[in-house]
């Protein structure tokens, strides 16, 4: 038996930040679980982890180069990624594992979310504008 995961197909980070919500076909309340976010088509780079259990507060881990926070819903984990760089544009996959109570469960691979990080293109106003035309 596998948990199903739903993610937005695409998110655009205009201000170098994005909320990626991972929605599960499973209630995480009073469970020990590990939710993670993986970068790349082959899910090779784990960038963010949220660990939760019934007796302590949520623990969030960010890989060096990523600034990540996590929020827990009954059937979701939302990863808040900040300070993203344009070169971190990629497809990101949500993963979930539930360890306790038994049985151990994990998810069917999701379709992923393309996070498109838009660069900040600031148009500076000229310091010394030319003479205005009448």
């Amino acid at each position: 038996n596998k948990i199903l995961v739903k993610q937005s197909p695409m998110l655009v980070a205009y201000d170098n930040a994005v909320n990626l919500s991972c929605k599960y076909s499973y209630n995480l309340f009073s469970r020990e679980f590990r939710a993670s976010l993986h970068k790349g088509l082959d899910s090779a780079v784990e960038v963010c982890v949220v660990y939760g259990n019934y007796s302590q507060q949520l623990q969030v881990y960010s890989k060096t180069g990523f600034n990540c926070d996590g929020k827990l819903g009954n059937e979701s984990v939302t990863f808040y990624l900040q300070n993203l760089y344009v070169n971190q544009t990629d497809i990101y996959f949500c993963k979930i594992e539930v360890m306790y109570p038994p049985p151990y469960l994990d998810n069917e691979k999701s379709n992923g979310t393309i996070i498109h990080v838009k660069g900040k293109h600031l148009c500076p106003s000229p310091l010394f504008p030319g003479p205005s035309k009448p």
Partner: nanobody, 124 residues
């Protein structure tokens, strides 16, 4: 809950070698990392080396690169620290740590569980 038991510490002469072991037990997920930190008398606990479950990510403190090697046996849930060319400044209590992060983290705050420590003494 994860339990960690270290072994392998002892006294050795400068230039000598030791191998530390750390066995983990408890509920494990498909990825996590284990690391070694050390604490000399009157000093902060500092990062030495770490490795993740998939063994595709390892990291070392600059001071031990080329002298120490971290490895793990996933079938035994055990991580090893092979220490060679030991110096007097390597004398410390060595602690094994466990983190739910899936990469070789050097950040002490990422580690959730710690072993009891094993003493390594390097002296002529």
């Amino acid at each position: 809950e994860v339990q960690l038991v270290e072994s392998g510490g002892g006294e050795v002469q400068p230039g000598g070698s030791l191998r530390l072991s750390c066995a983990a037990s408890g509920r494990m997920f498909s990825n996590y990392a284990m690391g070694w930190f050390r604490q000399a008398p009157g000093k902060e606990r500092e990062f030495v080396a770490a490795i993740n479950y998939r063994r595709d990510d390892a990291d070392y403190a600059e001071s031990v690169k080329g002298r120490f090697t971290i490895s793990r046996d996933n079938a035994k849930n055990t991580v090893y620290l092979q220490m060679s060319s030991l110096r007097a400044e390597d004398t410390a209590v060595y602690y094994c740590g466990f983190t739910y992060a899936g990469w070789a983290s050097s950040r002490r705050d990422d580690y959730n569980y710690w072993g009891q420590g094993t003493l390594v003494t390097v002296k002529p």
